[in-house]
């Protein structure tokens, strides 16, 4: 039950996180005009990863896309790439995790397969979250650096724009959305990985082996072969971690919990 809850919660948290990453990537307010020196500005600038906008006090807003690819700074391209990779990994992770959910039955899917998928999606969410956090942090660092620069340009050649010296930029709402969303995706991924540990097959970690002792046909279930097999007594059929050891007549090999970690 706890495993299902952890997995379900991990999925929901990751879903919210990825939605946030997508929102942040699409938002125009990655950097906003710093109004410290001019709080009564008539024209307010803000910029995103894809376009820059101007909002007039008249209520009119105009946005212009960065219609150049080669003219954009490498840092901006890197941030775009990180965010897109984060979204793609997150989307794939979501797709995988839907099928991995314990509460959803798909044919005769083994628990081991669900455990595998849960771990895969968890790792994808973690990487996705890290990509988003990295992307937002790189952009934030770029803003901090440029904020204190005395030169006029912030993004040299960005979309053919020239920044005037009085226009300084500070953190926009998208950065905070991105950080929070990345964090949520990361947390969701960790929860999925934790849930995976409890999803391995509910089986005993040994098989019944027949031993033929001089004329008697008795089936022994060894419990005291600690030295030779690595197992201790498991009379209550508790789930234990095997070290990868298998009995000779085991036909199908199930990965243990340790195989995922």
């Amino acid at each position: 039950m706890a495993v299902t809850a952890c997995q379900g919660l991990g999925f929901v948290v990751s879903l919210i996180g990825i939605a946030g990453i997508i929102a942040a990537t699409c938002m125009d307010q990655w950097s906003t005009q710093d109004l410290y020196n001019n709080p009564v500005t008539a024209v307010f600038n803000y910029q995103g990863l894809w376009r820059s906008c101007v909002r007039e006090s008249s209520g009119f807003t105009e946005c212009r896309g960065y219609f150049t690819l080669l003219g954009l700074p490498a840092m901006l391209q890197a941030v775009r790439a990180l965010m897109i990779v984060g979204i793609v990994l997150g989307a794939i992770g979501l797709l995988v995790s839907i099928f991995a959910l314990k509460c959803i039955r798909i044919g005769s899917m083994e628990d081991s397969a669900k455990a595998n998928m849960t771990l895969t999606s968890g790792i994808m969410f973690i990487v996705s979250g890290l990509c988003a956090i990295a992307g937002v942090s790189v952009f934030a660092n770029m803003l901090v650096t440029n904020f204190w620069m005395s030169t006029a340009n912030m993004y040299t050649g960005m979309g053919g724009m020239v920044q005037t010296v009085q226009t300084r930029y500070t953190f926009g709402a998208a950065l905070f959305v991105g950080w929070v969303a990345g964090g949520l995706t990361l947390i969701g991924g960790v929860m999925m990985c934790i849930a995976c540990r409890g999803l391995a097959p509910e089986e005993t970690n040994y098989k019944a082996v027949s031993y033929h002792a001089s004329g008697h046909s008795v089936a022994y279930k060894p419990g005291g072969f600690k030295a030779s097999t690595g197992f201790g007594s498991n009379t209550k059929n508790k789930k234990i971690y095997d070290g990868g050891a298998r009995t000779e007549d085991e036909v199908q090999s199930y990965p243990s919990k340790h195989d995922y970690v």
């Epitope: 803000y46 906008c53 006090s57 008249s58 209520g59 920044q163």
Partner: antibody
Framework: EVQLLESGGGLVQPGGSLRLSCAAS????????MSWVRQAPGKGLEWVAT????????YYADSVKGRFTISRDNSKNTLYLQMNSLRAEDTAVYYC???????????WGQGTLVTVSS | DIVMTQSPDSLAVSLGERVTMNCKSS????????????LSWYQQKPGQPPKLLFY???TRESGVPDRFSGSGSGTDFTLTISSVQAEDVAVYYC?????????FGQGTKLEIK
């Protein structure tokens, strides 16, 4: 047809108060930023105050700051300018204007004359 | 505050003549975000309220005859009337729309010889 009609002007003594009104019609008043601009007799234009669409932000010329208050009533499609502590230099024709793209004032009322004299 | 200076203060021209008036701002009116110059031109005929001619320095307001043209960027702007007509007699004002307080130039008075 867009129309802006100012009222409330008149003769007032220095230190007195006056409230100007501007009745707007022919457009969605609540969707536009509005301004007051004045023109002293035989002189040029002087921007007085601006109120943003929602009314949350107001801007004033230094010469009127603290004395004049711009406000709006979107339900009545009316713009106001409350003028307190009037001075002789406030004597002018006051125009109500509508701001559009580029912060330009595309429509102006006919103006109302405010005379501050003892 | 941005100071707007117009030149000349007045000019008298013959009908059909080309006329140019200038407006200079104390700081750039070019907005980096959209590459627009936040300057507008107004025409005020005697006894009438001003009428908008241009916004964003060169965007003609609807209904304005195409003999009028606006140009310039940064701090220097020009209003040109290619062929002056009798009805063009007025005072022309430029205005800073870039930042508050909005400021007007002192105006250029156009007369017919």
């Amino acid at each position: 047809e867009v129309q802006l009609l100012e009222s409330g002007g008149g003769l007032v003594q220095p230190g007195g108060s006056l409230r100007l009104s501007c009745a707007a019609s022919g457009f969605t008043f609540s969707s536009y930023t509005m301004s007051w601009v004045r023109q002293a007799p035989g002189k040029g234009l002087e921007w007085v105050a601006t109120i943003i669409i929602g009314g949350s932000y107001t801007y004033y010329a230094d010469s009127v700051k603290g004395r004049f208050t711009i406000s709006r009533d979107n339900s009545k499609n009316t713009l106001y300018l409350q003028m307190n502590s009037l001075r002789a230099e406030d004597t002018a024709v006051y125009y109500c204007t509508r701001l559009v793209k580029g912060q330009a004032m595309d429509y102006w009322g006919q103006g109302t004359l405010v005379t501050v004299s003892s | 505050d941005i100071v707007m200076t117009q030149s000349p203060d007045s000019l008298a021209v013959s009908l059909g003549e080309r006329v140019t008036m200038n407006c200079k701002s104390s700081q750039s009116l070019l907005q980096s975000g959209n590459q627009k110059n936040y300057l507008s031109w107004y025409q005020q005929k005697p006894g009438q309220p001003p009428k908008l001619l241009f916004y964003w320095a060169s965007t003609r307001e609807s209904g304005v005859p195409d003999r009028f043209s606006g140009s310039g960027s940064g701090t220097d702007f020009t209003l040109t009337i290619s062929s002056v007509q009798a009805e063009d007699v007025a005072v022309y004002y430029c205005q800073n729309d870039y930042s508050y307080p909005f400021t007007f130039g002192q105006g250029t008075k156009l007369e017919i010889k």
